[in-house]
Every structure is written in structure tokens, then in C-alpha cells.
Interface confidence: low
């Protein structure tokens, strides 16, 4: 199964932890209970890892079969123009956004979402597998 | 073990232009930014630029006119280049790999200096 | 651009002496992303403390990071000679990033 399928969530996998799906060359963890977005940041980067950064839309899809309409946080800020919590542009996707205080990105089944960043919201952790 | 080894001329002449090739091991530029920044000793340690995994450059505004920062994947190479140097860009130039939230592992530098 | 401003420039500490040398930034910095990185002479930079408060790999416990906001700090509980460097303290919030005018730090 780990061979043989793209992504996988199975326990014999040994290159991503428990509770984590691995997908190519990263480890994807989606949460269960739901924080703020610093608070999802900081969860993440204490586990050696980052709130999700989307490199393509091909990986956009795959994440996004895996989600239902909750939304969760992605590691995407409006700092004068939206950007990935490493600094790079989001240049692959728009983004939804009714407020301007809603500087913070969400991600469900459906689409890139802003919302205020003190929203509780479940979110995705991201790294590269070892 | 990580490593950003970096290959590029001591001596540059005013008005020419500084190529500074950094090589990567132990991480893959698919997955991880690469900054470049330079140290001087009037003005102390200067981020420049950055090329990320995707293959997108931002630069720091004061430079943006005459940097190119350049990759290939596959020989895990970036490229740095700076026009029209002059006296001032005297400098040691380093390629940093980003782990967020810092930039944690620093390439030996390369010490320029610009004069005729 | 936000301004990170160390001080001292210079300062010299007796061995077993506790040390701390501050970094103030123009405008509020996330804690998750102000950094500081030690250089001896003939080196490049090492990251030594990141996140505000969190050691890096291989660095002693004496040394300890603290701060929010726009004020920092970084604090050595009891001064050893390998720890006479140059610290410079960077914010990775926003671009351009930027470093502070190093701290050094020598032996009495």
C-alpha cells in the first residue's frame, strides 16, 4: 500500500509519524481540534514542521479530497498582498475575501477562503518527510 | 548533512559584475527557499534576496535593479548575480537555507572585494 | 523595513559573570520570528536562538532568549570564554528581513 498509492495513511509507513499522511516527499498532519492562527502556527513549528504551504494546484487538489467544507488554516498571511508564511507569493490560486480585516488564509473541499485570524479553525501542518 | 557550499571570484573590478554559484547537499531546492545575504563592515549584515522552492525570487528593494537570483534543481545549484558593482559591495556574500521560522544553515561566504 | 537596534555594540564580561545585550525593533515583531545568530572571527553566522527563546541544536542551557513585541533580549547565566562572539539579533517577519548591529561580546 505505501509503494503503491501516491499518498497513504497507513501505519507501516515508516517516514511520516503516527497521525500524520504522507503524500510525494511531505507529511501532512490535519487537526482535529481547532485553534487561532498563531496558535496553529506555533503547533506546528513546535513539531518540526509549518502550517501548510500549497506549492501547485496539483497539490491543492490532492489536500483538498481529504477536506470537508470546515475550513482549516494554511500557513497564509495578507501582508500587503497575500503570501505563504515563508514569504513566497500565492500566485497559483485567488483567494476569497470579504473584510479587510480578514488577513489570514483558510482552506476547505471548495476553495481558498480569508478570515479573520482569531477564528478558531482546525488546520494543516506540513513537512518534509525524513 | 546540510550544506551550502558557495564558488565565486575574490576580486571584482568597479562597473563589472559578481557571479556567486551556491551548492546545496542535504536538503532539495524543491522543497527549501535559499537567501542570499551579504556582510560589510560599515553597514553590518544586509538581506539581499531570495529565491524559493517554487522557483519565485523576491529582492530587497535596494538591490532589485541589478540582482538575479537564479536556480537549477537537478544540480542543486542557485545563482547569484549583481551588476555595476562598486567599492561599497565590498563584501562577504552568503547563501542561507530557510528552515521557517529562521534561516538556519549559512554557506561558508564568498569574500569580494571590488577594486580596480 | 523594520529597524533592529543592539545594545551594546561592545561589551566585555568577566568569566561566571551574567550577561544580557538587548535587541528593540522600529515595530512589533512576532516572537516566533525574531531570531538571534552568534559569528566568531573567520566564521559565518550560526543560528543560536530562534523563536525568541528557543536554543538551537548544541547550544548550552546558559544561554537563554526572552522578549516580545519590540524588545528582546538574550541572556548568558554565567559567561564562558567560548561564548566571547559577535551576536546579532534578525526579524523574519516581513521583507525586507533584517539584522541588528551585533553585540560584542569579548572577556574582561
Known amino acids: 500500500l505505501c509503494q503503491g498509492s501516491k499518498y497513504s495513511t497507513c501505519a507501516s509507513c515508516p517516514s511520516c509519524p503516527d497521525h500524520w499522511m504522507k503524500y510525494g516527499n511531505h507529511c501532512y498532519y490535519f487537526s482535529v481540534e481547532k485553534k487561532d492562527w498563531i496558535s496553529s502556527l506555533e503547533f506546528c513549528l513546535a513539531r518540526d514542521s509549518h502550517l501548510l504551504m500549497i506549492t501547485d494546484k496539483q497539490e491543492m487538489s490532492l489536500l483538498q479530497d481529504f477536506l470537508s467544507e470546515a475550513f482549516h488554516w494554511v500557513g497564509l498571511r495578507n501582508n500587503s498582498g497575500w503570501r505563504w508564511e515563508d514569504g513566497s507569493p500565492l500566485n497559483f490560486s485567488r483567494i476569497y475575501s470579504n473584510s479587510l480585516v480578514q488577513t489570514c488564509g483558510a482552506i476547505n473541499k471548495n476553495s481558498l477562503q480569508a478570515s479573520s485570524c482569531e477564528v478558531s479553525l482546525q488546520w494543516v501542518c506540513k513537512k518534509v518527510s525524513p | 548533512q546540510v550544506q551550502l557550499k558557495q564558488s565565486g571570484p575574490g576580486l571584482v573590478q568597479p562597473s563589472q559584475s559578481l557571479s556567486i554559484t551556491c551548492t546545496v547537499s542535504g536538503f532539495s531546492l524543491t522543497t527549501h527557499a535559499v537567501h542570499w545575504v551579504r556582510q560589510s563592515p560599515g553597514k553590518g549584515l544586509d538581506w539581499l534576496g531570495v529565491?524559493?522552492?517554487?522557483?519565485?525570487?523576491d529582492y530587497n528593494a535596494a538591490f532589485i535593479s541589478r540582482l538575479t537570483i537564479s536556480k537549477d534543481n537537478s544540480k542543486s545549484q542557485v545563482f547569484f548575480k549583481m551588476n555595476s558593482l562598486q567599492a561599497d559591495d565590498t563584501a562577504i556574500y552568503y547563501c542561507?537555507?530557510?528552515?521557517?521560522?529562521?534561516?538556519?544553515?549559512w554557506g561558508q561566504g564568498t569574500s569580494v572585494t571590488v577594486s580596480s | 523595513q523594520i529597524v533592529l537596534t543592539q545594545s551594546p555594540a561592545i561589551m566585555s564580561a568577566s568569566l561566571g559573570e551574567r550577561v544580557t545585550m538587548t535587541c528593540t525593533a522600529t515595530s512589533s515583531v512576532s516572537s516566533t520570528y525574531l531570531h538571534w545568530y552568534r559569528q566568531k572571527p573567520g566564521s559565518s553566522p550560526k543560528l543560536w536562538i530562534y523563536s525568541t527563546s528557543t536554543l538551537a541544536s548544541g547550544v548550552p542551557v546558559r544561554f537563554r532568549g526572552s522578549g516580545s513585541g519590540t524588545s528582546y533580549s538574550l541572556t548568558i547565566s554565567s559567561m564562558e570564554a567560548e561564548d566571547a562572539a559577535t551576536y546579532y539579533c534578525?526579524?523574519?517577519?516581513?521583507?525586507?528581513?533584517?539584522f541588528g548591529g551585533g553585540t560584542k561580546l569579548e572577556i574582561k
Open positions: 534578525h526579524q523574519y517577519r516581513r521583507s525586507p528581513y533584517t
Open positions: 542561507v537555507r530557510l528552515l521557517l521560522p529562521a534561516m538556519d544553515y
Open positions: 529565491i524559493w522552492s517554487g522557483g519565485n525570487t
